[in-house]
Amino acid sequence: QRLPRMQEDSPLGGGSSGEDDPLGEEDLPSEEDSPREEDPPGEEDLPGEEDLPGEEDLPEVKPKSEEEGSLKLEDLPTVEAPGDPQEPQNNAHRDKEGDDQSHWRYGGDPPWPRVSPACAGRFQSPVDIRPQLAAFCPALRPLELLGFQLPPLPELRLRNNGHSVQLTLPPGLEMALGPGREYRALQLHLHWGAAGRPGSEHTVEGHRFPAEIHVVHLSTAFARVDEALGRPGGLAVLAAFLEEGPEENSAYEQLLSRLEEIAEEGSETQVPGLDISALLPSDFSRYFQYEGSLTTPPCAQGVIWTVFNQTVMLSAKQLHTLSDTLWGPGDSRLQLNFRATQPLNGRVIEASFP
């Protein structure tokens, strides 16, 4: 499936459900622990203050030790913006010492800008993508991913952080947005809706997709996530929309089949390594790109967002498993964890294809 940019592209199915994005910000590496805050239903989103869920908890990356052959990733608080006014927000709390973004949720208090002033910034994420208004940029070459195929051992940590399900990625997953724009993948997480209600963070012509995957990367110019936060291009997120298709997606099933084990907020399990690139669309050449922010507190800006034109297909059962298995704080289901779309404020979204 592809987004409807050109006439020959498949039209988007279904209209926007009207539900707004709760978890919208791209998950930062280790966004797991970041709280996401969205406006409660009925509350108007304040300009620039829309739900910016901080990316999922970002892991802190330290310089590689040759002996260990791997980087150390530590959770770094990430901020996502509050969700759409119409969408209920789930509470997600972080209890990390020294983390001033410890308490945020989708909807309700505290307003995200109070959690992190950056959430009221002018260049926030997610945004609504209008393909016909995107600027074709021939310089945007196909994305390059290296080392995303992982053997089953050692296993990877899959965690319910209260506002998303996050898979912590090992060192060595390299991604290039272009010459000299090199990154290392830190973590991936998902945003979803509820039964019959879509939950992607980004939208296309106002259409919200059932779900969205975010793979959070740290620029190789930085050794740690906290050094990169707020720096232009310091973080990059690859985002893809998840849609319903007729067949089970075997790559996603390797993760979805383990969600029952982490139904409780804060729980985690170990899953065999897998081909991470199989979770993304196969067409790395057609995408939209813009500079935005984390979609959860701290809502740091300067994040390069790359949104694939091609979508990923999951079965109806898989999408149901994603949206109906996990629990957040306070006996509430972990659902509608997306942030409302944010104003472009003059930003131009670029497209890698005409």
Epitope: G69, F148, P151
Partner: antibody, heavy 119, light 110 residues
Framework: QVQLVQSGGGLVQPGGSLRLSCAAS????????MSWVRQAPGKGLEWVSA????????YYADSVKGRFTISRDNSKNTLYLQMNSLRAEDTAVYYC????????????WGQGTMVTVSS | QSVLTQPPSVSGAPGQRVTISCTGS?????????VHWYQQLPGTAPKLLIY???NRPSGVPDRFSGSKSGSSASLAITGLQAEDEAHYYC??????????FGGGTKLTVL
Amino acid sequence: QVQLVQSGGGLVQPGGSLRLSCAASGFPFSSYAMSWVRQAPGKGLEWVSAISANGGTTYYADSVKGRFTISRDNSKNTLYLQMNSLRAEDTAVYYCANNGNYRGAFDIWGQGTMVTVSS
Amino acid sequence: QSVLTQPPSVSGAPGQRVTISCTGSSSNIGAGYDVHWYQQLPGTAPKLLIYGNSNRPSGVPDRFSGSKSGSSASLAITGLQAEDEAHYYCQSYDRSLSWVFGGGTKLTVL
């Protein structure tokens, strides 16, 4: 220092059984996946079996599936390989190795223990 | 027969540069899985020499380097020394759910 010390090898008749042990020290054993790799006399290396850090997932080469069982006791920092229905072609030096490298490499190896299957 | 193919032997004079190739298939190296190299001196256990295609663990001299392209990989040794005489094995992961090795290459320092 980081090391893997093996024991349990020896001479066994075809159809017999043997249990190999691999004691780890100097690193957090319970956090690492482990494997067994063997080397027949004068031959190359052959991966035999692997086990996840918590012992919940195991993998076997087709040549030993159904006959060998890998296990671990994290409280004792020890890895095991139970070998049943041994055949002459199982004769080899058996190495335990740490599967901890995130890219799938074996970065720490035991000293090896010889298993001879002969009548 | 090994899943990964290596030349049985290579040789070189001290100070020279030698390379050892390792050829796989679309289910292992060609599928994107990393290649690792081990050195095995006579009568000893293998030692990790290169991991993740081109990374050296600490303590391994920079005379050793690795590279990967498509379904094959290679190990290069420059400034050959007598103590480099050993067997060298490449290793990767295969989609058949197994870790696979090459047959090994005996390096002789003339």
